[in-house]
Amino acid sequence: EVEKTACPSGKKAPEIDESLIFYKKWELEACVDAALLATQMDRVNAIPFTYEQLDVLKHKLDELYPQGYPESVIQHLGYLFLKMSPEDIRKWNVT
């Protein structure tokens, strides 16, 4: 798990874009807003995040949606789906 640290000045992510691939794991945790990530999940698949970085993004979504992801997020998981466990998927209320 990534340690909680303050986001460095000027690094708060205004959107989910390719510049984030240059962020260290702790910077992603500190500087990417989970709600922003949830609304821009469709962008994640086009960005070459490492597997470790995908772990951080999943952790942020898990904190935002502890009871399971909404369908709007599930529909845009893309490669992040590879990080989902059976326990994660069982929480989903997919219609």
Partner: nanobody
């Protein structure tokens, strides 16, 4: 599985050039991106440049305008052309590949090739 083998490292003078190559073999289908990372003495491993399977390239600020990444999809090889090299570019350079389908999704790494910039 996926294997990556780097070549092209060496000793070069400041201002000189090198071209690194990284050849992928094995489960080369479904590689979605390939990139180069480096780790200098006492530093963390950092991303230098990455290119997607669609040819979209991104560069760290420290190498923009000096380094160029390219990928030969047919040969499953990624290249890093390094020009105007500086002493601070001295590092072990690692090739990285993203594989994003079953079986064996994940990030794969080469063994690294040493680049030394010194007069």
């Amino acid at each position: 599985q996926l294997q990556l083998v780097e070549s092209g490292g060496g000793l070069v003078q400041p201002g000189g050039s090198l071209r690194l190559s990284c050849a992928a073999s094995g489960s080369v289908n479904s590689i979605t991106a390939m990139g180069w990372y480096r780790q200098g003495p006492g530093n963390e491993r950092e991303l230098v440049a990455v290119i997607t399977d669609r040819g979209r390239a991104s560069y760290a600020d420290s190498v923009k305008g000096r380094f160029a990444i390219s990928m030969d999809n047919d040969k499953h090889t990624v290249y890093l052309q390094m020009d105007s090299l500086k002493p601070e570019d001295t590092a072990v350079y690692y090739c990285n590949a993203h594989r994003r389908t079953w079986p064996h999704p994940g990030d794969y790494w080469g063994q690294g090739t040493q680049v030394t910039v010194s007069s």
